[in-house]
């Protein structure tokens, strides 16, 4: 039966009507409107934008639109005492100072309240000392420094280039290495694509451009002062010393012109290999300290930022479902930006706005979705996914019982080459089927499907003729829904060609130059890629909310579970002797995966054959599909990461942005050869295999016939 029959509506109100209502020109108009002034979390400007969106969503036709506010810990520079870094001579005189602000882009010279570049949640401090260059400050970079090069970072200020991993992991690694300060900078090797001009003449990062960002290690906690619970009016708040995830050493970001001044004087050890060299005209010496003539000079940081409990506002819109109003499909993206938010987040917020408008238009014509759709404009994402996490903490009981799916809607573009999708395996078939029905916006693929251009440009490494779909990691607002609550989640955006553009993210990410003009002039003048992303995100929401049988295929989970089990087994098998010595076996895990595969197959057969006109049986089957993702949640969470509770996926312990499969086992095996107590270490591996095997088996049993 078609999804229309469930809600007894006229045939014209189907997916096609919804998609046809989406217009590129509207997305363009909304993006312009959202990017004219900064919308930093906790500011009056962002509160006003929340109220504007609330008002417009009501006009678009949603049943209700409410503001949900929380009082969370945020971080701001001191307006009268700016942050900067100096080179000081032996007399303590400052002979060089880093820039105090980015030169504003043309047309924005008179805009007030542009927050200068800073590392949010850096403690205050004025450390001085010798510099050590630590490449990307990844786990492996510190291994190279400490183990191979015998360079001690203790008591040093480290300078690391942005890219490859989440900046919070860089800071954590530096802290663990004993550093007393961290300088983060954008190297042209990572943020300047060859053959492209810097902004405003192109989309590359100018030398004075700086990436802002938080440096927390929250591990899914939300507000650092109220982990696990909403930061509401009667919240009990931890003291700052007990706050979750705050860095303990000063951190500050700079651009590559300023970095050049610090790096050109570096002495000490030469870089270990070419992977430690960027594109600046400097030797990329590791240090410690400056060379010959400059050996008496030191680096001094001046950081005066403050942490403040501040009110934030989510906008929550509801479109009530006609048949299953107690089943929620959520479309959410953040509203707060570091400055203008031309790409992050407003290219996503503009798409959400147009999706809401299209759904509202259908509703005004008498249509309703089968299930309830919730729309969210999250606040304070840039400060640690705070708005989404606090709302989910407040509504966790409802969400865990009623949450069907969460679709994330941050930046719609990070390039204009092809589609990029990260999602639960349950959504693979939904994404494939949807993209086969959408037109590709790509040059050279006129009249072809999005699926075709996507598959050609970004092929799956495992399955020929299929596109790449990646694991969910974190660093965005789906985190609490997927990693903590076990709600099936997905995200989609247009991306760059990773083969030819090896820089990290997009060059102007979190800089003052992320403007409307950046998008309109250089990334998507016709807004055709934005429209395609709107169709993908909106189409997923439409199907999830309106299809009679949930568009989840549990067999795809079976396939990836086998792949992940094979992968973790091969990692463990790098230590065959220890596996034998400590009787480490993966038999239980492979057995559970086999059982899951068989049960999922049988469930899928039943799904084809059952009587869809029987609402009780339909609801029962749909509940088994809805609760499958939930079944992968371990209520005890992962070791030392209680809010990462998904046993199959978690953000990598070494890079929050990346997803890791069987993370409990992976972390237990990581660097196991260096553990002081191998018996204990391998015991933990065995325990994690047990947890994973049990969880997979338990999840499989939720798909078995109920009686």
């Amino acid at each position: 039966k078609s999804s229309n029959e469930a809600t007894n509506i006229t045939p014209k109100h189907n997916m096609k009507a919804f998609l046809d209502e989406l217009k590129a020109e509207n997305i363009k108009k909304f993006l312009y409107n959202f990017t004219q002034i900064p919308h930093l979390a906790g500011t009056e400007q962002n509160f006003q934008l929340a109220k504007q969106i609330q008002s417009q969503w009501k006009e678009f036709g949603l049943d209700s639109v409410e503001l949900a506010h929380y009082d969370v810990l945020l971080s701001y520079p001191n307006k009268t005492h700016p942050n900067y870094i100096s080179i000081i001579n032996e007399d303590g005189n400052e002979i060089f100072n880093t820039s105090l602000f980015e030169p504003p882009p043309p047309g924005y010279e008179n805009v007030s309240d542009i927050v200068p570049p800073f590392s949010a949640f850096s403690p205050q401090g004025m450390p001085e000392g010798d510099l050590v260059y630590v490449n990307y400050a990844r786990t492996e970079d510190f291994f190279k420094l400490e183990r191979d090069m015998k360079i001690n970072c203790s008591g040093k200020i480290v300078i690391a280039r942005y890219g490859k991993v989440f900046r919070g992991n860089k800071v954590k690694n530096a802290q663990l290495a004993g550093a007393k300060g961290v300088i983060l900078y954008s190297d042209p090797a990572d943020y300047f694509a060859p053959g492209v001009k810097s902004y405003p003449d192109g989309w590359n990062l100018p030398g004075g451009g700086v990436q802002r960002g938080n440096i927390l290690n929250l591990n899914g906690a939300g507000d650092p002062l109220t982990p696990g619970y909403p930061a509401n009016e009667y919240a009990y708040r931890r003291g700052i010393a007990e706050a979750v995830g705050l860095p303990s050493i000063p951190v500050h970001p700079i651009g590559y012109y300023d970095a050049q001044k610090l790096l050109e004087k570096m002495g000490g050890s030469a870089p270990p290999d070419s992977s430690w060299r960027g594109s600046l005209k400097v030797p990329y010496n590791v240090g410690p300290g400056f060379t010959g003539n400059f050996s008496t000079q030191k680096v001094k940081m001046h950081i005066h930022s403050t942490n403040e409990v501040t009110r934030i506002y989510n906008v929550i819109g509801t479109l009530r479902g006609a048949v299953e109003p107690d089943r929620y499909v959520i479309l959410g993206g953040h509203r707060d930006s570091w400055v203008f938010g031309g790409i992050d987040p407003q290219s996503g917020a503009a798409v959400v706005h147009e999706i809401v408008r299209s759904f509202g238009t259908l509703k005004k014509e008498g249509w309703r979705p089968r299930r309830t759709i919730l729309f969210a404009s999250w606040d304070a994402e840039e400060f640690g996914l705070l708005g989404s996490t606090e709302w989910a903490e407040e509504n966790s009981r409802l969400l865990q019982e009623r949450g069907v799916a969460y679709i994330n809607a941050d930046s719609s573009i990070e390039g204009n080459y092809t589609l990029r999708v990260d999602c639960t395996p349950l959504m693979y078939s939904l994404v494939h089927n949807l993209t086969k029905e959408l037109k590709s916006p790509d040059e050279g693929f006129e009249g072809k499907s999005l699926y075709e251009s996507w598959t050609k440009k970004s092929p799956s490494p495992e399955f020929s003729g299929m596109p790449r779909i990646s694991k969910l990691g974190s660093g965005n607002d789906f985190e609490v829904f997927f990693q903590r609550l076990g709600i099936a989640s997905g995200r989609a955006r247009y991306t760059k060609n990773w083969e030819t553009n090896k820089f990290s993210g997009y060059p102007l990410y979190h800089s003052v130059y992320e403007t409307y003009e950046l998008v309109e002039k250089f990334y998507d003048p016709m807004f055709k890629y934005h429209l395609t992303v709107a169709q993908v995100r909106g189409g997923m929401v439409f199907e999830l909310a309106n299809s009679i049988v949930l568009p989840f295929d549990c067999r795809d989970y079976a396939v990836v579970l086998r792949k992940y089990a094979d992968k973790i087994y091969s990692i463990s098998m790098k230590h065959p002797q220890e596996m034998k010595t400590y009787s480490v076996s993966f038999d239980s895990l492979f057995s559970a995966v086999k059982n899951f595969t068989e049960i999922a197959s049988k469930f899928s057969e039943r799904l084809q054959d059952f009587d869809k006109s029987n609402p009780i049986v339909l609801r029962m089957m749909n509940d088994q599909l809805m609760f499958l993702e939930r079944a992968f949640i371990d209520p005890l969470g992962l070791p030392d990461r209680p809010f990462y509770r998904h046993v199959i996926y978690a953000p990598s312990s070494h890079n929050k942005y990346a997803g890791e499969s069987f993370p409990g086992i992976y972390d237990a095996l990581f660097d196991i050869e260096s553990k002081v107590d191998p018996s204990k270490a391998w015991g933990e591996v065995k325990r994690q295999i047990y947890v994973a095997a049990f969880t997979v088996q338990a999840a499989a049993e939720t798909l078995s016939e109920v009686a």
Partner: antibody, heavy 122, light 108 residues
């Protein structure tokens, strides 16, 4: 049109002071590093001073350090060179020049003014 | 302090290639910029960052830089190229701009 125009030159006695101005137009003055360069009659180019776009860094040639001060007024789009304790060897055409990269102040000089002549003579 | 050495003069026939050198200790590790100055006029940037050309400068002007020598090359020299040419670097050890002494290019 992007341009720089110097003014304030003239004849001045040794030991006295003079302030040169450089009016900028056609670009976002507050985003660029700015320099003063001089050229004595029949001689080569000699750099005098630089200020970064946000004035967080100012550097001077050894020959003028402690006597000359570079500054800028963003509201007036003007660069200044305050010269004191002038000497005969300061006689030169003084040019103001812009760094070609927004936010840089130690690169090349892509825009030059026509220059203003300063003569230090008793 | 850092010093840049240029030949005082270079002569070349029209249509030929002129090469003006700029010597400095390990100059290859620095970014070199070149200026053309005609009598009574302000200098004009012709090459920056070793080898990049500003818009409006003919392709005949090119630069290279390695080791202890940077070179400005003017191919198919024209009479209008006759001028003084200066090389320039930033000396990070003193935080000073340094100019070469200049080279007078004569077109025969």
């Amino acid at each position: 049109e992007v341009q720089l125009v110097e003014s304030g030159g003239g004849v001045v006695q040794p030991g006295r002071s003079l302030r040169l101005s450089c009016a900028a137009s056609g670009f976002t003055f507050s985003s660029y590093g700015m320099n003063w360069v001089r050229q004595a009659p029949g001689k080569g180019l000699e750099w005098v001073a630089v200020t970064s776009y946000d004035e967080s860094n100012k550097y001077y040639a050894d020959s003028v350090k402690g006597r000359f001060t570079i500054s800028r007024d963003i509201s007036k789009n003007t660069l200044y060179l305050q010269m004191s304790s002038l000497r005969a060897e300061d006689t030169a055409v003084y040019y103001c020049a812009r760094d070609p990269y927004s936010s840089s102040w130690n690169g090349a000089f892509d825009i030059w003014g026509p220059g203003t002549m300063v003569t230090v003579s008793s | 302090s850092y010093e840049l050495t240029q030949p005082p003069s270079v002569s070349v026939a029209p249509g030929q290639t002129a090469r003006i050198t700029c010597g400095g200790n390990n100059i290859g590790s620095k970014s070199v910029h070149w200026y053309q100055q005609k009598p009574g006029q302000a200098p004009v940037l012709v090459v920056y960052d070793d080898s990049d050309r500003p818009s409006g400068i003919p392709e005949r002007f090119s630069g290279s830089n390695s080791g202890n020598t940077a070179t400005l090359t003017i191919s198919r020299v024209e009479a209008g190229d006759e001028a003084d040419y200066y090389c320039q670097v930033w000396d990070s050890s003193t935080d000073h701009v340094v100019f070469g002494g200049g080279t007078k290019l004569t077109v025969l």
